[in-house]
């Protein structure tokens, strides 16, 4: 098999952090720097157990929506950029997302983008104001009162926050140490400079598969992975390892 000259050419997924109000559309852009003739572009959400769930895909010039039609992948006129959009985002859509590309034969390659975090904030309904007239301007004495009240409120809030932090930290010590991070916390990269793929490499699901219900995340997640491919991320270093068609079970969910 002819090995190509292939400089490191990663997918990008931006913005790295996106915040929207519930009900709004949330859009990330997945960028393929060099679009091949035949490819599949997948959009994933990372579950709390660090598993990837496919949301939607783009193949052969059309979108393949997932089970939830709110998730859409559309190709932009540039040909290299893809909009991955959540229509009418819900609070539980908050989490970690990424896109991945599978280059189909003959230049069979796998690329995965960096992760991006979506935060969907609750839409707070402002109570309607009774009159449209502007509020009366405060006198110097009134302003001082507002500052005083605000300071007290801030102090109380800080005290409550401190109490909550202590309450969260110390009971854990009495119950026994647990190395679990918060579920909402973005997944931290290890000390290694090279990105580690975390997509389940057990199979290539070219068709949609039924998602099995996920058991609750154990305190110490299992360390087993089917095959973790570590790609060098230095510019100019070779890209991902080419996959030969005969390499057995497909290593990436399509």
């Amino acid at each position: 098999l002819d090995s190509p000259y292939r400089p490191w050419s990663p997918l990008t997924f931006s913005p790295a952090q996106l915040t929207v109000l519930e009900g709004e559309n949330a859009t990330f852009v997945c960028h393929l720097p060099d679009v091949p003739e035949s490819f599949v572009l997948n959009w994933y959400r990372v579950s709390p157990r660090n598993q990837t769930d496919k949301l939607a895909a783009f193949q052969e010039n059309h979108t393949e929506p997932g089970k939830d039609r709110r998730f859409r992948v559309t190709r932009l006129p540039s040909g290299q950029d893809f909009h991955t959009t959540i229509l009418a985002a819900q609070l539980n859509d908050s989490g970690i997302y990424l896109c991945g590309a599978i280059y189909l034969p003959p230049n069979t390659q796998i690329y995965e983008s960096p992760r991006a975090e979506l935060t969907v904030k609750e839409r707070v309904l402002e109570p309607p104001t009774e009159s449209p007239s502007p509020p009366p301007r405060l006198t110097g004495q009134g302003q001082g009162l507002v500052v005083g009240v605000t300071s007290v409120l801030v102090g109380v809030l800080l005290l409550l926050l401190l109490t909550w932090v202590l309450a969260a930290a110390f009971p854990r010590a009495t119950r026994g140490a647990c190395a679990c991070g918060s579920e909402d916390e973005p997944l931290k990269e290890g000390p290694s400079a090279a990105p580690v793929f975390t997509v389940d490499y057990g199979e290539l699901d070219f068709q949609w598969r039924e998602k099995t219900p996920e058991p609750p995340a154990p305190c110490a997640p299992e360390q087993t992975e089917y095959a973790t491919i570590v790609f060098p991320s230095r510019p100019g270093s070779p890209g991902p390892l080419p996959l030969r068609p005969e390499d057995g079970p497909c290593p990436w969910p399509l």
Epitope: P4, P33, V35, Q80, P105, N107, F206, G239, R244, P245
Partner: antibody, heavy 116, light 112 residues
């Protein structure tokens, strides 16, 4: 209408060099990988080289690797094939094709003859 | 690389008849996505090759439905129904499962 027009073919001595060009029109050139395929006097087709849309990766057949270089200028909608250390077995009609493997469009070809 | 084998000549056919052209690959061209990575081209006399069929059975844009492709992972057939004079030429199959891309030697179709 997609059009690919090759030029630069000539009679050249063994060991010589030649640069072929392919002017593309009728499609968004920088969205497509491009390839060169040649047809020898026996009418056998041989894939020569492929270049991706953004020039990130190139592939060559073993018979030309190290001697031929495929390149492109997306601003000029042009594909090139620089051929060095030419051999008599490089004598062929050289076709420019759109695509990395599917080859949906071909030019009319340019003839390269390597002979003493 | 993958070796593609074709019969060089088909028996001359009469206009209006059907003809089958075969092609064999030294390894399976069926990929994990369920697609078979084989193309068919026709080169008419004095012309450049023209894509007829891609991914074993999908007709290229503008190609007559008289042309159809089929096969397994290693054995392939191009079927031409109701042959016309314009179908005369050399038919090539090509594998695109991996680089280097390889073509068969071609099968010449002639009319009686």
């Amino acid at each position: 209408e997609v059009q690919l027009v090759e030029s630069g073919g000539d009679l050249v001595k063994p060991g010589g060099s030649l640069k072929l060009s392919c002017a593309a029109s009728g499609f968004t050139f920088n969205n497509f990988g491009m390839s060169w395929v040649r047809q020898n006097p026996d009418k056998r087709l041989e894939w020569v080289a492929t270049l991706s849309s953004g020039s990130s990766y190139t592939y060559y057949s073993d018979s030309v690797k190290g001697r031929f270089t495929i390149s492109r200028d997306n601003a000029k909608n042009t594909l090139y094939l620089q051929m060095n250390s030419l051999k008599s077995e490089d004598t062929a009609m050289y076709y420019c094709t759109r695509g990395e493997s599917r080859f949906a469009y071909w030019g009319q070809g340019t003839l390269v003859t390597v002979s003493a | 690389g993958v070796v593609i084998t074709q019969d060089e000549l088909s028996n001359p056919v009469t206009s209006g008849e059907s003809v089958s052209i075969s092609c064999r690959s030294s390894k399976s061209l069926l990929y994990k996505d369920g697609k078979t990575y084989l193309n068919w081209f026709l080169q008419r006399p004095g012309q450049s090759p023209q894509l007829l069929i891609y991914l074993m059975s999908t007709r290229a844009s503008g190609v007559s439905d008289r042309f159809s492709g089929s096969g397994s992972g290693t054995d392939f057939t191009l079927e031409i129904s109701r042959v016309k004079a314009e179908d005369v030429g050399v038919y090539y199959c090509q594998q695109l499962i991996e680089y280097p891309l390889t073509f068969g030697a071609g099968t010449k179709l002639e009319l009686k």
